[in-house]
């Protein structure tokens, strides 16, 4: 008597955040007895696509040759073995950047900050937006933050960091988005280099409450709700 088929693993390469026009490959991994793989996209007719497994049969490839708004969204995959269909995979959120003009990222009072002091990163957009995201580059699991003001349209968002430690140093970019689609982001801002000087060390800095920190790929997204002034959206940023 076979147990329930384990849910497949779903991921995207080169990552789940893709610039408009770039290619992306979605992979679904199951077992050696998989005979077919199915990819479903939320709010699209199911199945969105079907593929035969690649040798040695435990995964399938779904190709998107050129990223557009239509491909952005939430995906799950399944595989079929002789005993039936598997459970659905955990969701994959495919995000497209380049949907809106790039915001401006700056540091207040300065991108040169002494360890132990405070700094605020300010993300500003030309047109009003309701979602702003901040990422730190070149980390294994870069931080991703969101700030949402009751869905109100804003031209900027502030990301306070206090107290600053050497861990905060690095290159940041921000994005802006409209709440009706968290899968469509602006072009990235120009990079901002945050330079931390001094020797005060705190290996586990805690961002202030308006900043939500992603722990890694196991995090599931928490969508902002109107009742929470500063609600966090957590995603693994590839």
């Amino acid at each position: 008597q076979a147990g329930p088929l384990p849910k497949p693993t779903l991921w995207a390469e080169p990552g789940s955040v893709i610039s408009w026009g770039n290619s992306v490959t979605i992979w679904c991994q199951g077992t050696l007895e998989a005979r077919e793989y199915r990819l479903d996209k939320e709010e699209s007719p199911a199945p969105w696509d079907r593929q035969n497994p690649l040798e040695p049969k435990n995964k399938a490839r779904f190709s998107i040759p050129s990223m557009t708004e239509d491909y952005a969204g939430r995906y799950r995959c399944y595989y079929r073995s002789p005993v039936g269909w598997s459970q659905p995979s955990d969701p994959l959120e495919l995000v497209m950047t380049g949907a809106y003009s790039k915001p401006t990222l700056s540091a207040l009072p300065s991108p040169l900050v002494t360890s132990g002091k405070s700094v605020t990163l300010l993300c500003q957009s030309r047109s009003p937006m309701d979602t702003f995201l901040l990422i730190k580059e070149r980390a294994a699991h870069p931080l991703l933050h969101l700030r949402s003001e009751h869905g109100a349209q804003q031209h900027q968002a502030e990301f306070p960091m206090s107290p600053v430690t050497s861990v905060h140093g690095g290159t940041y970019r921000c994005f802006s988005s409209h709440g009706f689609s968290h899968y469509l982001l602006s072009h990235p801002s120009d990079p901002l280099e945050l330079i931390v000087s001094g020797s005060l060390e705190d290996p586990r800095p805690s961002p202030t409450r308006s900043v939500s920190t992603a722990a890694g790929p196991e995090d599931q997204p928490l969508m902002p709700t109107g009742s929470v002034p500063h609600s966090g959206l957590r995603r693994h940023w590839e």
């Epitope: 147990g3 329930p4 384990p6 992979w27 991994q29 050696l32 007895e33 073995s81 002789p82």
Partner: antibody
Framework: EVKLVESGGDLVKPGGSLKLSCAAS????????MSWVRQTPEKRLEWVAT????????YYPDSVKGRFTISRDNARNTLYLQMSSLRSEDTALYYC?????????WGQGTLVTVSS | DIVLTQSPATLSVTPGDSVSLSCRAS??????LHWYQQKPHESPRLLIK???QSISGIPSRFSGSGSGTDFTLTINSVETEDFGVFFC?????????FGAGTKLEIK
Amino acid sequence: EVKLVESGGDLVKPGGSLKLSCAASGFAFSSYDMSWVRQTPEKRLEWVATISSSGSYTYYPDSVKGRFTISRDNARNTLYLQMSSLRSEDTALYYCERLWGAMDYWGQGTLVTVSS
Amino acid sequence: DIVLTQSPATLSVTPGDSVSLSCRASQGLTNDLHWYQQKPHESPRLLIKYASQSISGIPSRFSGSGSGTDFTLTINSVETEDFGVFFCQQSNSWPFTFGAGTKLEIK
């Protein structure tokens, strides 16, 4: 907690036979592909055999094909490796692993020594 | 059979350093390349699967990259407990094969 415990390793003469077992717990054994990998005295890792979740498909490298047989008893949550016509180069620490794309869980190993 | 060549054979690093370990395949693997760490008297443990996919419970300082024939395991800011032998393994075609390993020593 996923746990894999190998047993059955022993000192055996060239040409002899041995059957290894791997007791699995902490996951739905019958739903996962399983493998055996061995580590030689020189610390090299060599894949030995793989069996699909229901036991319908088995895979071997040429070095053990026809001499080793991988099997499983899903009712007992146990994986087996029947080894015959053993050679000195089969001397190794034998591990069983759960195969989920990659070998994501390994047992502690059981030592097989082939020597006259 | 696909041959995996790992380099360097041995690497001696100081805690806090970042290191890159290489695994080169004799033919293209797409992304079917996995990384394991083995400490003395312990079983191997999976660090990265499918070239870049992180594994639950593995510290985020371990990351993987590459596709085709060239793959890299990077350890950002090595810690003292990161010593051991690191193996790559391919699952692109039978027979599955392993590299000979890179030994990481902590100075």
